[in-house]
């Protein structure tokens, strides 16, 4: 791991209780094609172990969704951000579903050891737990 | 190539016959900006040559499409998966077009030498063959 | 930098004058989480400093947008391309908003030292300048 090849790909475990917009993730070969090489999970949230610039990517699909459903429940928004430590709290990536049922995006961002990433889904629709429809990952790119 | 820098970016060649949902890809500098460095094409499907974790990405745009077209003919769905060997067959990435005319996403996934990736477009709309609208690629990330 | 780890992530600075569809970008730690390690900005456009295959990614969100706004102002299109040198001018990546308010995609493409990338937003809607909604970046992947 000293090469700095930190990488993780997570699948959705569950959503939080009603007032908690966070998605809770899980990863590991026993679960399918998800994995953590370097980063760790802390109560379903992804914690970074190595400083550097990372490619962060996410796809979230809403469960049993049609464009009518999505527009009727608008606004449904997904935000990826650093949620702890509080001093580094910031939104990194934000998308609304509008009349679609899936959002997918990616970005490069500097992350530091100890940063915990949260993925907040606001709205009243549930995310699909299918592993090919909803996933979240990071890849270390450079120091 | 021994550094493990396997990478490929493909452009759409053609769709299959009516009952075959697979998209058939092509790549190489003579065709424009597509290329294969490591992976190979087998009858238009991408075959992996090196074990590792890969970033798989795809964008597909529907031909002469408006949001009316896209919603009228729902469901149009794109799935990327391992289609052979059969023992490793699995869907890796799935998106529906709903009221949009383009889907784009990416994910990290472990792939093994000999895995062949298929991209299945279900529905009765044609994918655009423009090279800036429809493309598919993989990038080796780590062992 | 000799390792070839060229990478940049930019945030929107401003749009061009009315007849100029280009988006003008900015980057640097003083601005937030944007940065340039290798590539440079030339009058708000990204210039490549090292030959190689790059992962290019972008997300653009339209300002104060609903699906009604987006469909009423259709077509709104985002194209990423090499705009100079003129001899290498080509569109690399193109997406329309249709009834959505955000586009996001990525692709692998060969770029050469001196290539300048332009991001053209056609239509009458303005892009959001929020750094978690609109961003553009490149990552060197291999020679």
């Amino acid at each position: 791991e000293s090469l700095g090849w930190d990488v993780a790909e997570l699948q959705l475990n569950h959503t939080g209780p009603q007032q908690d917009p966070r998605l809770y993730w899980q990863g590991g070969p026993a679960l399918g094609r998800s994995f953590l090489h370097g980063p760790e999970l802390d109560k379903g949230q992804l914690r970074i172990h190595r400083d550097g610039i990372y490619m962060v990517h996410i796809q979230v699909t809403l469960a049993i969704c049609s464009s009518t459903t999505a527009s009727r429940h608008h606004p449904t928004t997904l935000a990826v951000g650093i949620c702890s430590p509080a001093s580094r709290s910031i939104s990194l990536l934000r998308l609304s579903f509008h009349q679609g049922c899936t959002i997918a995006s990616q970005r490069l961002t500097p992350l530091a050891r100890g940063d915990t990433l949260c993925t907040n889904l606001t709205g009243t629709l549930l995310p699909s737990r299918n592993t090919d429809e909803t996933f979240f990952g990071v890849q270390w790119v450079r120091p | 190539e021994s550094l493990g820098w396997d990478v490929a970016e493909l452009q759409l060649n053609h769709t299959g016959p009516q009952q075959d949902p697979r998209l058939y890809w092509q790549g190489g500098p003579a065709l424009g900006r597509s290329f294969l460095h490591g992976p190979e094409l087998d009858k238009g499907q991408l075959r992996i040559h090196r074990d590792g974790i890969y970033m798989v990405h795809i964008q597909v745009t529907l031909a002469i499409c408006s949001s009316t077209t896209a919603s009228r003919h729902h469901p149009t769905t794109l799935a990327v998966g391992i289609c052979s060997p059969a023992s490793r067959s699995i869907s890796l990435l799935r998106l529906s077009f709903h009221q949009g005319c383009t889907i784009a996403s990416q994910r990290l996934t472990p792939l093994a030498r000999g895995d062949t990736l298929c991209t299945n477009l279900t529905g009765t709309l044609l994918p655009s063959r423009n090279t800036d609208e429809t493309f598919f690629g993989v990038q080796w990330v780590r062992p | 930098e000799s390792l070839g780890w060229d990478v940049a992530e930019l945030q929107l600075n401003h749009t061009g004058p009315q007849q100029d569809p280009r988006l003008y970008w900015q980057g640097g730690p003083a601005l937030g989480r944007s940065f340039l390690h290798g590539p440079e900005l030339d009058k708000g456009q990204l210039r490549i400093h090292r030959d190689g295959i790059y992962m290019v990614h972008i997300q653009v969100t339209l300002a104060i947008c609903s699906s009604t706004t987006a469909s009423r102002h259709h077509p709104t299109t985002l194209a990423v391309g090499i705009c100079s040198p003129a001899s290498r001018s080509i569109s690399l990546l193109r997406l329309s908003f249709h009834q959505g308010c955000t586009i996001a995609s990525q692709r692998l493409t060969p770029l050469a030292r001196g290539d300048t990338l332009c991001t053209n937003l056609t239509g009458t809607l303005l892009p959001s300048r929020n750094t978690d909604e609109t961003f553009f970046g490149v990552q060197w992947v291999r020679p």
Partner: antibody, heavy 120, light 111 residues
Framework: EVQLQQSGPELVKPGASLKMSCKAS????????IHWVKQKPGQGLEWIGY????????KYNEKFKGKATLTSDKSSSTAYMELNSLTSEDSAVYYC?????????????WGQGTLVTVSA | DIVLTQSPASLAVSLGQRATISCKAS??????????MHWYQQKPGQAPKLLIY???NLESGVPARFSGSGSGTDFTLNIHPVEEEDAATYYC?????????FGGGTKLEIK
């Protein structure tokens, strides 16, 4: 086998309206758009519009807006076209047609046509 | 609307020879990497029959003596070798945008 069976010939007076039918069989009616095409005697073909029985989505050629109204009855797998304020210019054979496998406006299956004659 | 102009309006071709029908569009009907031009055959008292779709694809069940070519604005339908049963009127049609339009037709007579 896909079949589009159209209603019989009509002789109508100027100013009247008429509703012709196109009964589909051999496929799932709600899966395919039905298009309507006009052909005046000894002349070429003109696209009138389409209807998607799945959700009654319609599109009309500007030239036929206000002249033609497209509807369908899912229970009987039948598409209808109503023509109003008929004049001699509306005398023609009217065809219903179904798209091919791909969902674009080219026409793989046709009805036999309904001949409309407008005459006092 | 896109205007399609067919030529000639009529032609007579000997049995076994080649018939060539031209269709010219007022603007390009190519888009998204496809050419949205189609060809039909219509015999007297019958509905049109699809022969060729997307400029060059033969519809199922259509004999291989029919072929289509062209891109952009200029298109050709070839019939070779012509047979007696090919006597009919031939129409080109585009589906590049709404409304789809048809050419004026070319009447083929077999000598």
């Amino acid at each position: 086998e896909v079949q589009l069976q159209q209603s019989g010939p009509e002789l109508v007076k100027p100013g009247a309206s008429l509703k012709m039918s196109c009964k589909a069989s051999g496929y799932t009616f709600t899966d395919y758009v039905i298009h309507w095409v006009k052909q005046k005697p000894g002349q070429g073909l003109e696209w009138i519009g389409y209807l998607h029985p799945y959700n009654d989505d319609t599109k009309y050629n500007e030239k036929f807006k206000g002249k033609a109204t497209l509807t369908s009855d899912k229970s009987s797998s039948t598409a209808y076209m109503e023509l109003n304020s008929l004049t001699s210019e509306d005398s023609a054979v009217y065809y219903c047609a179904r798209r091919g496998y791909y969902d674009y406006a080219w026409f793989a299956d046709w009805g036999q046509g309904t001949l409309v004659t407008v005459s006092a | 609307d896109i205007v399609l102009t067919q030529s000639p309006a009529s032609l007579a071709v000997s049995l076994g020879q080649r018939a060539t029908i031209s269709c010219k569009a007022s603007k390009s009907v190519s888009a998204s990497g496809y050419t949205w031009m189609h060809w039909y055959q219509q015999k007297p008292g019958q509905a049109p029959k699809l022969l060729i779709y997307l400029a060059s694809n033969l519809e199922s069940g259509v004999p291989a003596r029919f072929s289509g070519s062209g891109s952009g604005t200029d298109f050709t339908l070839n019939i070779h070798p012509v047979e007696e049963e090919d006597a009919a009127t031939y129409y080109c049609q585009h589906s590049r945008e709404l409304p789809p339009t048809f050419g004026g037709g070319t009447k083929l007579e077999i000598k």
